[in-house]
């Protein structure tokens, strides 16, 4: 059994998340994950899910009763999702920590927007002229 | 030229994001994107970047001066990043809108944690028994 399972069960007790009523009104994550089979689509969704859990864990980081469980689970996420790569995890953390209300961050984000957009689709790897032709064609054919 | 370029330039004026000092202290997103060549790694990072922009746009949604620009850019993100797939965009939005401080959401998230974790790595597509053997082997051989 993976080491996180026991610790996740401990978290369930702490949050009373084993109660039958927890399943009411559908799932948060599981149904969404079932919708997406393509690896790149899954990563888009899992990225949001992982950042949710990291925020959740941060909110409870000072609670001694679950500290060990949280650390074990975070380590397992680092192994599974970030492939034990600290740089990948660090870059991810930087992105999740930017404040959307900070005016300097806002200005930087808008300053970078054109370049970010140019790289958004996998097609971005094709030469620029060819890509913009494809894009116009795609828009026209929609 | 892609339609978002003109609108992004409009946003730059609105946010004074064309000023030379904006580039001080490095980039928010561009250097991080340069680090990651693998499509699945890029999607992990881009997912966070796109959710940042959506939050930013939400904060300024009532400002008439940039409403058209914001709408055009959002549409372009939908085309490029979500491949014009409304379901993909809707699932993404659901994930970004969950409140990490809502106790019902917390309980559900913890309830689903074991299953989410089991699907985090690409190896999750292998049959469950085989996967858990692999993972134990990976930890043991590390």
């Amino acid at each position: 059994q993976d080491p996180y399972v026991k610790e996740a069960e401990n978290l369930k007790k702490y949050f009373n998340a084993g109660d039958p009523d927890v399943a009411d009104n559908g799932t948060l994550f599981l149904d969404i994950l079932r919708n997406w089979k393509e690896e790149s689509d899954r990563k888009i969704m899992q990225s949001q899910i992982v950042s949710f859990y990291f925020k959740l864990f941060k909110n409870f980081k000072d609670d001694q009763r679950i500290q060990k469980s949280v650390e074990t689970i975070k380590e397992d996420i680092n192994v599974k999702f970030f492939n034990s790569n600290k740089k990948k995890r660090d870059d991810f953390e930087k992105l999740t920590n930017y404040s959307v209300t900070d005016s300097n961050v806002q200005r930087k984000a808008v300053h970078e927007l054109i370049q970010v957009m140019a790289e958004l689709s996998p097609a971005a790897k094709i030469g620029k002229r060819k890509r913009s032709q494809m894009f116009r064609g795609r828009r026209a054919s929609q | 030229q892609d339609p978002y370029v003109k609108e992004a330039e409009n946003l730059k004026k609105y946010f004074n994001a064309g000023d030379p000092d904006v580039a001080d202290n490095g980039t928010l997103f561009l250097d991080i994107l340069r680090n990651w060549k693998e499509e699945s790694d890029r999607k992990i990072m881009q997912s966070q970047i796109v959710s940042f922009y959506f939050k930013l746009f939400k904060n300024f949604k009532d400002d008439q001066r940039i409403q058209k620009s914001v709408e055009t850019i959002k549409e372009d993100i939908n085309v490029k990043f979500f491949n014009s797939n409304k379901k993909k965009r809707d699932d993404f939005e659901k994930l970004t809108n969950y409140s990490v401080t809502d106790s019902n959401v917390q309980r559900k998230a913890v309830h689903e944690l074991i299953q989410v974790m089991a699907e985090l790595s690409p190896a999750a597509k292998i049959g469950k028994r085989k996967r858990s053997q692999m993972f134990r082997g990976r930890r043991a051989s590390q």
Epitope: S84, N85, K86, D90 | N35, W36, K37, A140, Q142
Partner: antibody, heavy 123, light 112 residues
Framework: EVQLLESGGGLVQPGGSLRLSCAAS????????MSWVRQAPGKGLEWVSA????????YYADSVKGRFTISRDNSKNTLYLQMNSLRAEDTAVYYC????????????????WGQGTLVTVSS | NFMLTQPHSVSESPGKTVTISCTRS????????VQWYQQRPGSSPTTVIY?????PSGVPDRFSGSIDSSSNSASLTISGLKTEDEADYYC??????????FGGGTKLTVLG
């Protein structure tokens, strides 16, 4: 001040065994991944093995897998390397090194390093 | 498995600037942190750069690290060379599969 002190090196015949120890002080030992790195005489550095802070995960270079075993005793602040089936090409100075960044369960960089202990495999 | 390739030796005069390269054979140099270690004769290695471009406290700002994705290489630059900088320098990175790779090392000679 962080200190790492290796011991247990010496002369051993091919096929023999040795156990290296690394006594650590000056930091919370259990919070850091630890590694062994070796350097053959006049040659470059080669990573040998690593272990997570808890001791739950271990990692080996292909050249030593199945022959060397890394372990730690967090109550004694000590790291070990059990070396079996030693070969002439294992002759080197063996350094123990702490991970430079705390809270990450696999080492990403090595800082500081101990002074090293020489292992000579020869008949 | 990738390899990290460094020049065998470099030499420069005191006061000048020297750059040591570290080229990754496959995979992206930017996708894992690169470290640089200095090893003086008869001593253990010490870190001069970690996480691509960070300097540990006590390391002078004459030492700097950078990454160049276009050449898939990392560089260690030492400005205002001093005789005490004469040493072997090793780059190091993690390979993402629980292995840690070192470059072959570069012998820096400070002339004069």
């Amino acid at each position: 001040e962080v200190q790492l002190l290796e011991s247990g090196g010496g002369l051993v015949q091919p096929g023999g065994s040795l156990r290296l120890s690394c006594a650590a002080s000056g930091f919370t030992f259990s919070s850091y991944a630890m590694s062994w790195v070796r350097q053959a005489p006049g040659k470059g550095l080669e990573w040998v093995s690593a272990i997570s802070g808890s001791g739950g995960s271990t990692y080996y270079a292909d050249s030593v897998k199945g022959r060397f075993t890394i372990s730690r005793d967090n109550s004694k602040n000590t790291l070990y390397l059990q070396m079996n089936s030693l070969r002439a090409e294992d002759t080197a100075v063996y350094y123990c090194a702490k991970d430079g960044s705390s809270g990450w369960y696999v080492p990403h960089w090595f800082d500081p390093w101990g002074q090293g202990t020489l292992v000579t495999v020869s008949s | 498995n990738f390899m990290l390739t460094q020049p065998h030796s470099v030499s420069e005069s005191p006061g000048k600037t020297v750059t040591i390269s570290c080229t990754r054979s496959s995979g992206s140099i930017a996708s894992n942190y690169v470290q640089w270690y200095q090893q003086r004769p008869g001593s253990s290695p010490t870190t001069v750069i970690y996480e691509d471009n960070q300097r540990p406290s006590g390391v002078p700002d004459r030492f700097s690290g950078s990454i160049d994705s276009s050449s898939n290489s990392a560089s260690l630059t030492i400005s205002g060379l001093k005789t005490e900088d004469e040493a072997d320098y090793y780059c190091q990175s993690y390979d993402g599969s629980n292995r840690w790779m070192f470059g072959g090392g570069t012998k820096l000679t400070v002339l004069g």
